[in-house]
């Protein structure tokens, strides 16, 4: 009886393992074993597949052919028993376009209101991805163990750090790696649980900002008690996104050691040109807070996006506001020669809530405000480049009093 | 590992435009800093400049600009051009990595330019 | 630019002994100041960075000190791979600009 050759060849390529997968022809016929060969593109002779050489199931691994990923490749099968098959030929494919990223590993830290994720490519030092190591953006799930309401988290890297949780909580989460560039989405890791800690005495410090005078930073920074002392770090942003870099490593900035205030200077010229990150720490001498969220700082925009500076003007019902060119030291005005967007926040100063307004323009009314009432201000500029799309810290918040009654003309 | 070779000539008549190269292996230049750093035959250190992460290059302001540092990161490999040298460029020529302030973490060995006429 | 002045510019010890090199600059730097070491023929090596954090891999009987204009370096119990050059380098300001060396020899 002559052998029927396999049918429905799948190709399965996940990081550096490749599987076949095939349907035999004749179920009826015991003892059969089948075999690969494969050719490269412009190449007319056929090679044995090694590791596919006489199976008797239906999968077999060729991870161990080194093949280069980018280059198409064909594939064909027979059946054998005392005689064989005719071949049968699967459709040339390119292993890198055909791979998927498999799951990626992930590790978790806990702290009281946060969790540290670590995540690494799950095949290490991958052939596949040789090329794209370094452009694995990762996106996860998660959610408290008790409620399983989802969280979506997308475009992070191989650092992550999700803050405002909640302490002694078990959290879920699920990792999953993509390369934008390739247009691939990988495939989820294990679910991982975490417990955060018992809540910490001391909360980490909050609204960290940077500002500019004269040829200085100025780090500021919110705390909720006194007679503390801080310490802020620095890290190159770049070593956020590369896997497994063991130059990872905060460093201090020696004018912001042990400072006793909510703030502390340093010059900018320290800092090469670039995009940093920037964490504080409070310690009482006893204990220590978790670091602060961390935030961005970019020297370059840093540098010339100061606050801006206003004049209000009060009515009954309503203030003008004239927004001017920030001031730098020696009272000068800074030309900033790119358009502003201005984001003017305002509220009572009896209450916390907020009102927000965006404007182009340089003169803003602030409408539907009561009389007799103090209300306060602040206002940031933000770039309208898009590929800029940075904002300058809050000015100093300024507080006017509405005028009586009937005085809005 | 971060490793850092630098490469040139060796010899040079002044006048002459030459490059030198600092080839980097271990870690990709579209990451950090990579800086050029000469030492005189007295001994003395000095600080060129350095090319960034992505492209933007900074020099030392006390030096005259006949030099000028760039990179090509399909080679992760970073260059500094001397223009018309002077016997004054005689020096060992190191490039180095920083993070981000201005100290340098990982070295090449040096390679010696000599100009001469 | 800022200055760094260092002392001495030689110096000849022994093995085991402790020996101590300085760096003035000629205006305060904040503790913004690497000190590293070279081998005759090898590159500078980064010893000390904010003028007191040990560099990864740098043995503990390094220990760098100072504040303001002042600094030292101080290696406690020296070894034979210890000997060769010194350099001082501050980074609190643009350019950045290094010590003159100080040259440390077996006695």
């Known amino acids: 009886k002559n052998l029927k050759s396999p049918q429905k060849v799948e190709v399965d390529i996940i990081d550096d393992n490749f599987i076949l997968r095939w349907n035999r022809s004749d179920e009826s016929v015991g003892n059969v074993t089948f075999s690969f060969d494969y050719q490269k593109t412009g190449m007319d002779n056929w090679i044995k597949l090694s590791g596919c050489q006489n199976i008797t199931s239906t999968k077999c691994n060729f991870s161990s052919l080194k093949l280069n990923v980018y280059e198409e490749i064909k594939l064909r099968i027979r059946a054998e028993k005392e005689n064989t098959s005719s071949w049968y030929e699967v459709d040339s494919f390119t292993p890198f376009r055909k791979a998927q990223i498999g799951p990626p590993e992930v590790h978790l830290e806990a702290e009281d209101k946060a969790i540290v994720i670590h995540i690494s490519p799950g095949t290490k030092d991958s052939v596949m991805w040789a090329l794209d190591g370094l452009s694995f953006t990762y996106s996860l799930v998660i959610w408290k163990n008790s409620s399983g309401v989802e969280e979506r988290i997308e475009n992070i890297y191989s650092r992550h750090k999700i803050y405002k949780l909640s302490p002694e909580t078990t959290y879920c989460l699920k990792v999953k790696a993509a390369l934008l560039t390739s247009w691939k989405i990988g495939v989820y890791s294990p679910v991982h649980c975490i417990k955060t800690t018992v809540e910490n005495e001391l909360p980490p410090p909050e609204n960290i900002e940077v500002s500019v005078q004269n040829q200085n930073y100025v780090l500021k920074w919110d705390y909720t008690y006194a007679n503390m002392t801080f310490q802020v770090q620095w890290l190159h942003a770049f070593l956020k996104r590369n896997p497994g870099n063991h130059l990872y490593k905060w460093k201090q900035i020696p004018d912001c050691e042990n400072v006793k205030t909510t703030q502390c200077v340093f010059p900018q010229n320290v800092f090469q040109k670039g995009i940093y990150l920037l964490r504080v720490q409070a310690s009482d001498g006893n204990n220590t807070s978790f670091w602060s969220e961390e935030i961005k700082f970019d020297t370059e925009i840093q540098a010339f996006l100061l606050p801006p500076v206003f004049n209000i003007r009060s009515l009954s019902d309503s203030f003008h506001i004239y927004i001017g060119a920030p001031k730098q030291s020696g009272n000068t005005p800074v030309i900033q020669d790119y358009p502003l967007i201005y984001e003017i926040i305002f509220w009572e100063n009896t209450s916390n809530a907020e009102r927000k307004i965006i404007e182009k323009k340089t003169d803003v009314t602030v409408p539907n405000l009561k009389p007799l009432t103090v209300y306060c201000v602040k206002a940031r500029a933000h770039t309208m480049d898009e590929k800029l799309n940075k904002s300058s810290v809050f000015s100093d918040a300024v507080c006017e009093k509405t005028k009586p009654g009937n005085t809005s003309k | 590992e971060v490793q850092l070779q630098e490469s040139g000539p060796g010899l040079a008549k002044p006048s002459q435009t030459l490059s030198l190269t600092c080839s980097v292996t271990g870690y990709s230049i579209t990451s950090d800093y990579w800086n050029w750093i000469r030492k005189f035959p007295g001994n003395k250190l000095e600080y060129m400049g350095y090319i960034s992460y992505s492209g933007n290059t900074d020099y030392n302001p006390s030096l005259k600009s006949r030099f000028s540092i760039t990179r090509d990161t399909s080679k992760n490999q970073f260059y500094l051009q001397l223009n018309s040298v002077t016997t004054e460029d005689t020096a060992t020529y190191y490039c180095?990595?920083?993070?981000?302030?201005?100290?340098?973490?990982?070295w090449g060995q040096g390679t010696t330019l000599t100009v001469s006429s | 630019d800022i200055q760094m002045t260092q002392s001495p510019a030689s110096l000849s010890a022994s093995v085991g002994e402790t020996v101590s090199i300085t760096c003035r600059a000629s205006?305060?730097?904040?503790?913004?100041l690497a000190w590293y070491h070279q081998k005759q023929g090898k590159s500078p090596q980064l010893l000390v960075y904010?003028?007191?954090t040990l560099a990864d891999g740098v043995p503990s009987r390094f220990s760098g000190s100072g504040s303001g204009t002042q600094y030292s370096l101080k290696i406690n119990s020296l070894q034979p791979e210890d000997f060769g050059s010194y350099y001082c380098q501050h980074f609190w300001s643009t350019p950045p600009t290094f010590g003159s060396g100080t040259k440390l020899e077996i006695k």
């Open positions: 904010n003028a007191k």
């Open positions: 180095a990595r920083s993070e981000g302030m201005y100290f340098f973490d990982y």
């Open positions: 205006g305060n730097i904040h503790n913004y």
